[in-house]
C-alpha cells in the first residue's frame, strides 16, 4: 500500500463524495494531553511533552455529498492527527547554512485499519436515493516514513514532512527560501 493512498482527510473513499476538512489547528493549551486521558487505549504509542503530542483519532461527524445528493444521515469519520513524537530531528549548521539531520527514524500518524459502511444518498428533485459503500478510517498508527518516499507522495502529510536528510542541505527549489526557513523554525 503506497503512502499516497493515505490522506489526512481520511475520506479517499468514493471520488465525488464530500471531503473532510483538515483537523483544526492544534493549541497547546487545549490539546488532549496524555495525562488528561489522552486518546482511546488501543493506541500504540503515547507521547507526552509540552510540545510533542501523540498520534490520535479525531472524530468528525458530517454529511457526505455526491454532486447534488447528500447522505440521509451524518457519518462519523476518524481522522488521524498528531505527532508520533518526540522530535527526531536536530539542527545542523556550517557557517550560515542550516539543515536538519535525523536522530531517529521518522514516523507518521496514518490510518491503520479501515471499515466499510453503506451510506444512503438522498437526491433532490425526486430522484431515487442512491446507496454507496464508503471506506472509513477505523484506527490510526505511527508508521515509518523513509526519505525514499518522494515529494509528491509526501504532500498529503503537511509541511513538516518533507524534511532534508542527514547531512544534506534542503533541496533547492523544493520550496521557497522563506518556506524552508519557517519549516526549520517550526519543526519542533
Amino acid at each position: 500500500q503506497g503512502w499516497q493512498a493515505f490522506r489526512n482527510d481520511a475520506t479517499e473513499v468514493i471520488p465525488g463524495l464530500g471531503e473532510y476538512p483538515e483537523p483544526p489547528p492544534e493549541n497547546n493549551q487545549t490539546m488532549n494531553r496524555a495525562e488528561n486521558g489522552g486518546r482511546p487505549p488501543h493506541h500504540p504509542y503515547d507521547a507526552k511533552d509540552v510540545s510533542e503530542y501523540s498520534c490520535r483519532e479525531l472524530h468528525y461527524t458530517r454529511f457526505l455529498t455526491d454532486g447534488p445528493c447528500r447522505s440521509a444521515k451524518p457519518v462519523t469519520e476518524l481522522v488521524c492527527s498528531g505527532q508520533c513524537g518526540p522530535a527526531r530531528l536536530l539542527p545542523n549548521a556550517i557557517g550560515r547554512v542550516k539543515w536538519w539531520r535525523p536522530n531517529g527514524p521518522d514516523f507518521r500518524c496514518i490510518p491503520d485499519r479501515y471499515r466499510a459502511q453503506r451510506v444512503q444518498l438522498l437526491c433532490p428533485g425526486g430522484a431515487a436515493p442512491r446507496s454507496r459503500k464508503v471506506r472509513l478510517v477505523a484506527s490510526c498508527k505511527c508508521k515509518r516514513l523513509t526519505r525514499f518516499h518522494n515529494q509528491s507522495e509526501l504532500k498529503d502529510f503537511g509541511p513538516e514532512t518533507a524534511r532534508p536528510q542527514k547531512g544534506r542541505k534542503p533541496r533547492p527549489g523544493a520550496r521557497g527560501a522563506k518556506a524552508n526557513q519557517a519549516e526549520l523554525e517550526n519543526a519542533y
Epitope: K48, D49, P86, L90, N103, R144, T146, G167
Partner: antibody
Framework: EVQLVQSGAEVKKPGASVKVSCKAS????????MHWVRQAPGQGLEWMGE????????GYNQKFKGRVTMTTDTSTSTAYMELRSLRSDDTAVYYC????????????????WGQGTTVTVSS | DIQMTQSPSSLSASVGDRVTITCRAS??????LNWYQQKPGKAPKLLIY???RLLSGVPSRFSGSGSGTDFTLTISSLQPEDFATYYC?????????FGGGTKVEIK
C-alpha cells in the same frame, strides 16, 4: 568508544517507584534520542519508549502510559527512566539503548546498549 | 501493536551445522527487520539490520533474508560462540516490538 553505563541493581516493594540512570560517553549526548528496553526473567525484549535530550520530549509505549517518565540531564549526559506503581511483573532487567544509522539504507537499529539494571519487585 | 513470532523457540544443533531461524510479522514491515544475539547476563548485540545488512565486524556466516512479513536468519556453519538466544525486531511501526527469541543450544 561509545558507552552507556547504567546504575546498579535495585530491590523494591510493590507500589514503590524506581529510577534507573544511564550515563552516556564517547559521543555527543544530545545527538541521539535515548531508548529504554526491558527484559523480564526468561522473557523477550520489550521497548518502553524514548526521549529527545534536546527538547525533553518523550514518547512511551502505551503499555506503560501513566507509570513511566523518562528524563535527561544534558550537563552530565545522563538519561533517567522512572517507573512508578511497581508490580511483581515489573521485575526485569532494564536497558538503555541508542540507535545507530545506515545512511545508504536510511535505516536505524539499536546499536549501543547499556549493561542493564536489574530491578526486583518483591514484598 | 505488530506481533513478531519467532520459530522455533529453541533448537539443538552441533558445531558446523547450518541453522535457520524464522521471524513472522503480523503485518507488512517492509525491510525494517533487525536481528540481535544475546548471551546470558549480557545485553543484546546487533547482528543484522534492514533484513540483510551485516553489521561491521559480524562474521559472514550470519545472513538474513525476507521481506514484508516473513524473515529468516541463517547461520551457515555454527561456531561454539554462536550458542545464544536470537531476537528479531521490527522498526516499521511504533511501538517497536521484538520476537520472543530463539535459543540455540548445543546438541
Amino acid at each position: 568508544e561509545v558507552q552507556l553505563v547504567q546504575s546498579g541493581a535495585e530491590v523494591k516493594k510493590p507500589g514503590a517507584s524506581v529510577k534507573v540512570s544511564c550515563k552516556a560517553s564517547g559521543y555527543t549526548f544530545t545527538d541521539y534520542n535515548m531508548h529504554w528496553v526491558r527484559q523480564a526473567p526468561g522473557q523477550g525484549l520489550e521497548w518502553m519508549g524514548e526521549i529527545n535530550p534536546n527538547s525533553g520530549g518523550a514518547g512511551y509505549n502505551q503499555k506503560f502510559k501513566g507509570r513511566v517518565t523518562m528524563t535527561t540531564d544534558t550537563s552530565t549526559s545522563t538519561a533517567y527512566m522512572e517507573l512508578r506503581s511497581l508490580r511483581s511483573d515489573d521485575t526485569a532487567v532494564y536497558y538503555c539503548a541508542r540507535l545507530g544509522y545506515d545512511d545508504i539504507y536510511d535505516d536505524w537499529y539499536f546499536h549501543v546498549w547499556g549493561q542493564g539494571t536489574t530491578v526486583t519487585v518483591s514484598s | 501493536d505488530i506481533q513478531m513470532t519467532q520459530s522455533p523457540s529453541s533448537l539443538s544443533a552441533s558445531v558446523g551445522d547450518r541453522v535457520t531461524i524464522t521471524c513472522r510479522a503480523s503485518q507488512d514491515i517492509s525491510n525494517y527487520l533487525n536481528w540481535y544475539q544475546q548471551k546470558p547476563g549480557k545485553a543484546p548485540k546487533l547482528l543484522i539490520y534492514h533484513t540483510s545488512r551485516l553489521l561491521s565486524g559480524v562474521p559472514s556466516r550470519f545472513s538474513g533474508s525476507g521481506s514484508g512479513t516473513d524473515f529468516t536468519l541463517t547461520i551457515s556453519s555454527l561456531q561454539p560462540e554462536d550458542f545464544a538466544t536470537y531476537y528479531c525486531q521490527q522498526g516499521d511501526t511504533l511501538p517497536y516490538t521484538f520476537g520472543g527469541g530463539t535459543k540455540v543450544e548445543i546438541k
